[in-house]
């Protein structure tokens, strides 16, 4: 089944997809679908990669990540109720029924009203020993360590706090990048 | 060291073919992205696409699909482009550029440009 | 295709200068942005790939930073041989687009 994510209307967000290159600089085709994930290909594509490039997307979705070093985690820009629904990732690699497909659920909430600006989550907390930050300022690194032997307890740990959208928010606006292995 | 030497100045009548050649040497040829960019007289720098050597893959700017082919010989390490159905706004000087995974696919050495006259 | 925005078009300069030129995504780019450099009758040549990573060789004085789709190249003391049209390029998607260019000149 599906790994749910959610995000308020007028955020962006955030929908995670992971993959290693076989070795540096070979990237596969990755598509991303409205929809889950069909036999071959991807229904309803927003975006697709090739060997080296983005060479297809609509308006409002892109890779913030380093796509080329395998993360291919999909941005959706300003959500709407409408951007609800499943979401299929489809790592191609080469070879019959070799594809990688993750079906990831998209839950858009109304946006909240708050009369306040409250303290954002301190998601190095939520992370120790795993981010690589990456500031505002001009190429200034950060480094509060490395993951050395992550297992699936961990992985799974972390996919249930990446589905709280407003941490993967404050995630992606820092710039920080989850490195797992 | 690594070298991209390009064929010379081409005069062509509105309508013809152009074939331009690109030899590299000093690094292995297959395993780099050969891009091809012109820049028109006075103006800014355009990609027409590349070829990966290795696979024979092209990508081509949509702009140009139908009238540009990119072809490359590995036993003499050279890069073809070629632009059919010339016009006179295709005067410009077109580039050989190599690009690897190393820069993200930037163009980090390029050939010394080819002069290509469009004129009736 | 993606269009990148480069201003401003001419620098007047002097020897020792700092000079900072932007260039603007018409979407995000994630850090896939490239600097060239021109100098008349000369190739380009790289010197900033994905955003803040200098080349192999290229002096210090030269920078890039940004994300998403603001984009800033600079070089801290400009010296006589910076004189050159310089061009931003996003290398994230195809067609690969190129900034206009910056041309700097003498003051």
């Known amino acids: 089944s599906e790994v749910e994510y959610r995000a308020e209307v007028g955020q962006n967000a955030y929908l995670p997809c992971f993959y290693t290159p076989a070795a540096p600089g070979n990237l596969v085709p990755v598509c991303w679908g409205k929809g889950a994930c069909p036999v071959f290909e991807c229904g309803n594509v927003v975006l697709r990669t090739d060997e080296r490039d983005v060479n297809y997307w609509t308006s409002r979705y892109w890779l913030n990540g380093d796509f080329r070093k395998g993360d291919v985690s999909l941005t959706i820009e300003n959500v709407t109720l409408a951007d609800s629904g499943i979401y299929c990732c489809r790592i191609q690699i080469p070879g019959i029924m070799n594809d990688e497909k993750f079906n990831l659920k998209l839950v858009i909430k109304p946006a909240k009203v708050t009369p306040a600006p409250t303290r954002q989550r301190d998601f190095t907390a939520a992370f120790p020993r795993m981010l690589t930050t990456r500031g505002h300022g001009p190429a200034e690194t950060q480094t509060l360590g490395s993951l050395p032997d992550i297992n699936l307890t961990q992985i799974s740990t972390l996919a249930n706090e990446l589905r709280d959208s407003r941490l993967a928010n404050d995630l992606r606006d820092s710039g920080a990048t989850i490195r797992i292995g | 060291q690594v070298q991209l030497v390009q064929s010379g100045a081409e005069v062509k009548k509105p309508g013809a073919s152009v074939k331009v050649s690109c030899k590299a040497s000093?690094?292995?040829?297959?395993?780099?992205?050969m891009d091809w960019v012109r820049q028109a007289p006075g103006q800014g720098l355009e990609w027409l696409g590349y070829?990966?050597?290795?696979?024979?893959?092209?990508s081509y700017n949509q702009k140009f699909k139908g009238r540009v082919t990119m072809t490359t010989d590995k036993s003499t390490s050279t890069a073809y482009m070629e632009l059919r159905s010339l016009r006179s706004d295709d005067t410009a000087v077109y580039y050989c550029?190599?690009?690897?995974?190393?820069?993200?696919?930037?163009?980090?050495?390029w050939g010394q440009g080819t002069t290509v006259t469009v004129s009736s | 295709s993606i269009v990148m925005t480069q201003t401003p078009k001419f620098m007047p300069v002097s020897a020792g200068d700092r000079v900072t030129m932007t260039c603007k995504a018409s979407?995000?780019?994630?850090?896939?942005v490239a600097w060239y450099q021109q100098k008349p009758g000369q190739s380009p040549k790289l010197l900033i790939y994905?955003?803040?990573n200098r080349y192999t060789g290229v002096p210090d004085r030269f920078t890039g930073s940004g994300s998403g789709t603001d984009f800033t190249f600079t070089i801290s003391s400009v010296q006589v041989e910076d004189l050159a049209v310089y061009f931003c390029?996003?290398?994230?998607?195809?067609?690969?687009?190129f900034g206009t260019g910056t041309k700097l000149e003498i003051k």
């Open positions: 070829i990966y050597p290795n696979k024979g893959g092209t």
């Open positions: 550029a190599r690009s690897g995974y190393g820069n993200y696919y930037t163009m980090d050495y």
């Open positions: 390029q996003q290398h994230y998607s195809s067609p690969s687009t």
């Open positions: 979407q995000s780019v994630g850090n896939n």
């Open positions: 994905y955003a803040s």
């Open positions: 000093g690094y292995t040829f297959t395993d780099y992205y």
